[in-house]
């Protein structure tokens, strides 16, 4: 529980005044206020809207409320020469063409500045050639297109369906494929569940509807011009061809009413199995290239956009702290939006606003957190979380030795069915104490806590009775803190049911159609589950910020090593005969787990008998509690990813949104039977075991007696 | 406050060139452009080109290229409109307007007082 | 270049008075459309922008709509400090143009 000693407030002034503060109508009228014109990263639209956020902040009573700025590389299309896509015949004329815009939805034709469907940072270029259908275009997709099927994609133009993994991903597998330009496109069987009609009336995708995006690879460099450098006025800035994490080709997104028109003249190979074909009336044949009769049409990009040094604002809030105002506990979430946001980030920072309203009602009335509290709305975070990024690069000297923990709050759902959370081990014991003291939304759950619905709609897949809690990946604000800087993370929002809805996202994910409306009419009428996720994200801030002892349980953390040194060692031994030639052993590994373990529970001893009252002994205590995330930070950072620096996890190398477990052992394994030189790839494996093995020991250090 | 405060009123020859100069104060220089626009007596205005200062990129109306320049000095937050090859019909109130440096922007918001300048002979 | 065609050029009104004017595009400028008010001797200000939006300070007697290309500035009840000249600005595309103006007169 809460505890209240050393910030002199009163009784009143505890969890659950800060809960009962929160509402859910304020939350629709915050979201319907932030999505009636569109707010995309470096437009005046967001600047109007990041003055107002700071506007209102301060009236809410925070202490401070500033804008960072940072001049940071975005990417728009032409106004004056649009992109598109082409079939053109044998002698060069276009017989068809992509839309160049999507049908507006019902209420906003007289809407201006909707950016068209673009890639982000796609490069200009107008490549022709025949087509090859590449499915999700994941590793594994290539590797049974070149290796099973034999088929080359060089100097092809290559058509992949949205889902599963980051599109960025996507480009960068294409790019090593050799292909000359990529058709992102969204299939009705990822993005169109069956039974729902498509917006405006239901909430599914319709033909006409494209998914924006940005399609960087930049491994948490944050703007591709400053990489680890804050894109301040006097920066240094690379030169494009230097930029980190450009695509090479160019790439632009389509609906699937266009989509059927390229795939359904495909010939060539037939789908190699069933999981390669979509919901379309088409073949899904992979080609290269048109069947018989079409046999000489080609495809034609036509790609105008540029890269441009684009001005962006974070708006940064403080609501300082009583007792330990050099301890940041920090709420971020992102402005800016592809269009109208309803969802995306809106609906997270509706909430973050009514948090920030209710913290403000609390202060105003006397009280103050234990801990300072910052809030922050971030900008360009579609473009490849700049925002954040760059201001933890300013600010780097700072979070690393005051930075507590950091909630993230883009999207508070893609879906209403039950609760979804991702954060580091540290906070499973606060999440789950948390949602026991929360009412359940949920349909046939009245009178229920939230913990017991969670629970039973998504069951942990290790341990009953409880609710699954995933790993932290990328995708989202909470990158730089987590993986480059070790600040203990989560992230908590409202998800679908994932056994039913095999779809990838939501549906109308960065559409036009990814309004106010959607949300109102088909996600979350009453605004209950929006209300659920500020209680959840705000209960974790007042919690993190408030309670004398940090609410983080080293023992969790303990638990989960134990389980990945287990995963990675199994993946190991699937090549057992090369284990024993090279020698690659993971008892170190084992043994500092185990270490850890032992230390982990010593502390926890500790932590229960220590005397509170002593300050110099609890800020001991709290320091290392708060030290532990940092303490699996790797300087050296991963092989060619000096910014994902956590040795634990850090965002799979084949899918920017899954986190993966000791990242640096998983990678030198992947493929390891294909690698030309074994005994240097084995070599690899060995050191990536011996710096997972001395970070965790390391670790485990950090929490032993300090003398 | 915002504010664009113009220098005064010129008097040209024809064939001569003028520069009016427009101070900003009041917000962040950098973060806007600085838009030109001219009003001859009593006719309507027209828009002559726009600068950038954070990027020193300007745009011009086709119909002054060749013949205005548009610069700006970041250090004291200061733009800069030269025309020249000065014509009777150039006579007129030229105005600087703030606007947004982004991708998307509302156009002018903010304006100078104008520099009222006549070209005589 | 994108032609803006105000009408009417002139009026006479009276305090009280519901006043309409409009600005035809000569082609597509979705919403990038802004109204300005300029009295004798003064500079131009920005009352209106992107059709709809007021601007902070300006009474709410002013509004702005559209129809397609057509754009209208209605002021719902004419006071004695409205007897300006307005302009619409079009800033879709360069160059960016103004209407011909409208020069509101006390009846």
């Known amino acids: 529980k809460s505890s209240n000693e050393a910030t002199n407030i009163t009784p009143k002034h505890n969890m659950k005044a800060f809960l009962d503060e929160l509402k859910a109508e304020n939350i629709k009228k915050f979201l319907y206020n932030f999505t009636q014109i569109p707010h995309l990263a470096g437009t005046e639209q967001n600047f109007q809207l990041a003055k107002q956020i700071q506007s209102q902040w301060k009236e809410f009573g925070l202490d401070s409320v500033e804008l960072a700025h940072y001049d940071v590389l975005l990417s728009y299309p032409n106004k004056t020469h649009p992109n598109y896509i082409s079939i053109i015949n044998e002698d060069g004329n276009e017989i068809f063409n992509t839309s160049l815009f999507e049908p507006p939805p019902p209420g906003y034709e007289n809407v201006s500045d909707i950016v068209p469907p673009f890639s982000a940072f796609s490069p200009q270029g107008m490549p022709e050639g025949d087509l090859v259908y590449v499915n999700y275009a994941r590793t594994e997709d290539f590797f049974k297109l070149e290796r099973d099927m034999k088929i080359n994609c060089s100097g092809k133009i290559v058509i992949a369906r949205y889902g599963k993994v980051f599109r960025g991903n996507k480009v960068k597998n294409a790019q090593l494929a050799g292909a000359k330009g990529v058709i992102l496109y969204s299939d009705p069987a990822d993005y169109f569940a069956p039974g729902v009609k498509s917006y405006p009336d239901g909430w599914n995708l319709p033909g006409g509807g494209v998914q924006r995006g940005n399609i960087l690879n930049l491994n948490g460099a944050g703007d591709p011009l400053t990489p680890g450098y804050p894109a301040n006025e006097y920066a240094y800035r690379r030169g494009i061809a230097e930029a980190v994490g450009l695509p090479s080709i160019p790439v632009h997104p389509i609906g699937y009413y266009d989509a059927q028109k390229l795939l359904e003249k495909m010939g060539g190979s037939a789908p190699p199995d069933s999981s390669w074909r979509g919901s379309l009336k088409v073949p899904y044949n992979v080609g290269p290239g048109f069947t018989g009769n079409f046999s000489t049409q080609k495809v034609k990009m036509h790609i105008h956009s540029t890269n441009e040094v684009t001005r962006i604002y974070n708006v940064i809030g403080t609501l300082r702290g009583a007792v330990e105002p050099d301890r940041y506990v920090i709420l971020g979430g992102h402005r800016d939006s592809w269009v109208f946001g309803g969802i995306d980030p809106q609906s997270g920072a509706a909430v973050v606003h009514e948090i920030v309203r209710s913290f403000g009602t609390l202060k105003k009335e006397g009280w103050r957190p234990r801990r300072t509290i910052l809030f922050a709305s971030w900008d360009a975070e579609e473009f490849g979380l700049l925002g954040s990024t760059e201001w933890a690069e300013e600010n780097s000297r700072l979070l690393q030795e005051r930075g507590v923990a950091y909630i993230n709050a883009d999207s508070s759902i893609e879906g209403n069915y039950t609760l979804r959370v991702d954060c580091t081990p540290l906070m499973y014991s606060l999440v789950h104490n948390l949602t026991k003291e929360l009412k359940s939304p949920d349909e046939g759950f009245e009178g229920k806590s939230l913990y017991e619905s969670w629970t039973k709609k998504s069951p942990s897949p290790e341990f009953s009775g409880m609710p699954r809690i995933s790993k932290l990946g990328s995708g989202n604000d909470f990158e730089v803190f987590f993986q480059r800087l070790g600040i203990a993370s989560g992230r908590a929002r409202y998800t679908k049911n994932w056994e039913t809805n095999k779809f990838s996202g939501y549906p109308l994910y960065h559409s036009v159609y990814e309004t106010y409306e959607l949300v109102e009419k088909f996600y979350d009428p009453m605004f209950k589950y929006h209300l659920t996720v500020a209680q959840v994200r705000g209960g974790m801030v007042f919690e993190l910020a408030n309670s004398i002892v940090l609410p983080f349980d080293c023992r969790d953390y303990a638990v989960v090593l134990r389980k990945y040194a287990d995963k990675i060692y199994s993946i190991s031994m699937k090549h057992p005969q090369e284990m024993k030639t090279y020698s690659v052993s993971f008892d170190s590994l084992f043994s500092a787990v185990k270490n850890f373990t032992e230390i982990a529970s010593k502390f926890s001893e500790r932590l229960q008998d220590f005397d509170k009252s002593n300050p110099i002994v609890l800020r001991m205590m709290n320091d290392q509690l708060m030290f532990l995330e940092r303490a699996f930070i790797d300087p050296l950072g991963l092989p060619d990813r000096p910014f994902y620096r956590h040795v634990i996890y850090a965002p799979s190398s084949h899918n920017k949104y899954a986190g993966e477990s000791f990242p640096g052992i998983y990678d030198a394994l992947f493929d390891i039977e294909s690698k030309v030189d074994p005994s240097k790839a084995w070599g690899e494996v060995k050191r990536q075991i011996y710096v997972a093995a001395f970070t965790v020991q390391a670790a485990a250090e950090t929490l032993s007696e300090v003398a | 406050e915002v504010q664009l405060v113009q220098s005064g009123a010129e008097v040209k020859k024809p064939g001569a060139s003028v520069k009016v100069s427009c101070k900003a104060s009041?917000?962040?220089?950098?973060?806007?452009?600085i838009s030109w626009v001219r009003q001859a007596p009593g006719q309507g205005l027209e828009w002559m080109g726009e600068?950038?200062?954070?990027?020193?990129?300007?745009y011009y109306n086709e119909k002054f290229r060749g013949r205005v320049t548009l610069t700006a000095d970041k250090s004291t937050s200061t733009a800069y409109m030269e025309l020249r090859s000065l014509r009777s019909d150039d006579t007129a109130v030229y105005y600087c307007?703030?606007?947004?440096?982004?991708?998307?922007?509302?156009?002018?918001?903010?304006w100078g007082q104008g520099t009222t300048v006549t070209v005589s002979s | 270049d994108i032609q803006m065609t105000q009408s009417p050029s002139s009026l006479s009104a009276s305090v009280g008075d519901r006043v309409t004017i409009t600005c035809r595009a000569s082609?597509?400028?979705?919403?990038?459309l802004n109204w300005l008010q300029q009295k004798p001797g003064k500079a131009p200000k920005r009352l209106i922008y992107?059709?709809?939006s007021l601007d902070s300070g300006v009474p709410s007697r002013f509004s702005g709509s559209r129809s397609g290309t057509d754009f209208t500035l209605t002021i719902s009840s004419l006071q004695p400090e409205d007897f300006a000249t307005y302009y619409c600005?079009?800033?879709?595309?360069?160059?960016?143009?103004f209407g011909g103006g409208t020069k509101v007169e006390i009846k």
């Open positions: 307007a703030r606007v947004f440096d982004g991708y998307y922007n509302y156009a002018m918001d903010y």
């Open positions: 009041g917000y962040t220089f950098t973060s806007y452009g």
């Open positions: 600068i950038f200062p954070r990027r020193g990129n300007t």
């Open positions: 082609q597509d400028i979705g919403s990038s």
């Open positions: 992107a059709t709809s």
């Open positions: 600005l079009q800033y879709a595309s360069s160059p960016y143009t």
